[in-house]
């Protein structure tokens, strides 16, 4: 779980380290804060959880690049 | 008004070593940044070196700079630069910029006017 | 790796003219993680647009910077003498990769 470390920061400090089923995603966001002590992606599934994973998988890229895809898909 | 001055620049020999200093005034490191060292050999683009979190010291470098350059905070306004192991290819003006907030994201809104080094023998 | 690239390396434009600089990411930055800025001659670069397409403060609205994914836009309209200078894109997705952050520049030269 990300930790707010004040109103407008969210640092990880651990990270998943297994796969989460890619339908489950509604939309990431990267953390690249000066108070965080890593930099991280953040996954928001659509129960509305936030996940914590690290940015240098493969697998998170991969992620990444399909969620951005849906975003640029414009649903009719 | 928030400046930034980098200093030590000077002609060095190959194999030579150099620290650089960028001086912050106008604002503090309380105030958490990401401070870079960019530089730019004559005629060429931007090249990103290294960056330091100004409130909690985490480094991140380019893997050409790794173990030739070491970034670090010397104070609540001085971030320094330093460079070992110098090859004519490291010529260059060295920048030193700071994020426009504590987000990598947001671009450098604020630079050092740069200082020359030169590496020559 | 989050390489970019800049295309054209140089262009010329006349006064009031329009010009389009092309930057490319190697992989997807998403779309809220790119930086431009403009460089003249014995000057540190200047911050023109951030997130994309958000301007810096005091930058003119003649600055449009667009994109997602992989491909990002700066247009700059109703060209001015003073934009004469060379532009780069930088990628704001990730500091864990710091090689090639920058594109290589674009030299705008204005007829």
């Known amino acids: 779980q990300p930790v707010g470390i004040n109103t407008s920061t969210t640092c990880c400090y651990r990270f998943i380290n297994k796969k989460i089923p890619k339908q489950r995603l509604e939309s990431y966001r990267r953390t690249t804060s000066s108070h965080c002590p890593r930099e991280a992606v953040i996954f928001k599934t659509k129960l509305d959880k936030e996940i914590c994973a690290d940015p240098t998988q493969k697998w998170v890229q991969d992620f990444m690049k399909h969620l951005d895809k849906k975003t640029q898909t414009p649903k009719l | 008004q928030e400046q930034l001055v980098e200093s030590g620049g000077d002609l060095v020999k190959p194999e030579g070593s150099l620290t650089l200093t960028c001086t912050a005034s106008?604002?503090?490191?309380?105030?958490?940044?990401?401070m870079c060292w960019v530089r730019q050999a004559p005629g060429k683009g931007l090249e990103l070196i290294a960056c330091?979190?100004?409130?909690?010291?985490?480094t991140y470098y380019a893997s050409w700079a790794e173990g030739r350059f070491t970034i670090s905070k010397t104070s609540s306004t001085t971030v320094t630069l330093q460079m070992t192991s110098l090859t004519v290819a490291d010529t260059a003006t060295y920048f030193c910029?700071?994020?426009?907030?504590?987000?990598?994201?947001?671009?450098?809104?604020?630079w050092g006017p740069g200082t020359l080094v030169t590496v020559s023998s | 790796a989050y390489d970019m690239t800049q295309t054209p390396a140089s262009v010329e434009v006349g006064v009031g003219g329009t010009v389009t600089i092309k930057c490319q990411a190697s992989?997807?930055?998403?779309?809220?993680?790119l930086s431009w800025y403009q460089q003249k001659p014995g000057q540190p670069p200047k911050l023109l647009i951030y997130?994309?397409?958000t301007l810096a403060s005091g930058v003119s609205s003649r600055f449009k910077g667009s994109g997602s994914g992989t491909q990002f836009t700066l247009t700059i309209s109703g060209v001015e003498s003073a934009d004469s200078a060379t532009y780069y894109c930088?990628?704001?997705?990730?500091?864990?990769?710091?090689?090639?952050?920058f594109g290589g520049g674009t030299e705008v030269v204005v007829k």
């Open positions: 910029a700071r994020t426009t907030d504590d987000n990598w994201n947001v671009g450098f809104n604020l």
């Open positions: 106008g604002f503090s490191f309380s105030t958490s940044y990401w």
């Open positions: 330091i979190s100004s409130s909690i010291g985490v």
């Open positions: 992989q997807s930055i998403g779309n809220r993680y």
């Open positions: 997130g994309t397409s």
């Open positions: 930088q990628q704001g997705a990730t500091i864990s990769y710091l090689d090639n952050a």
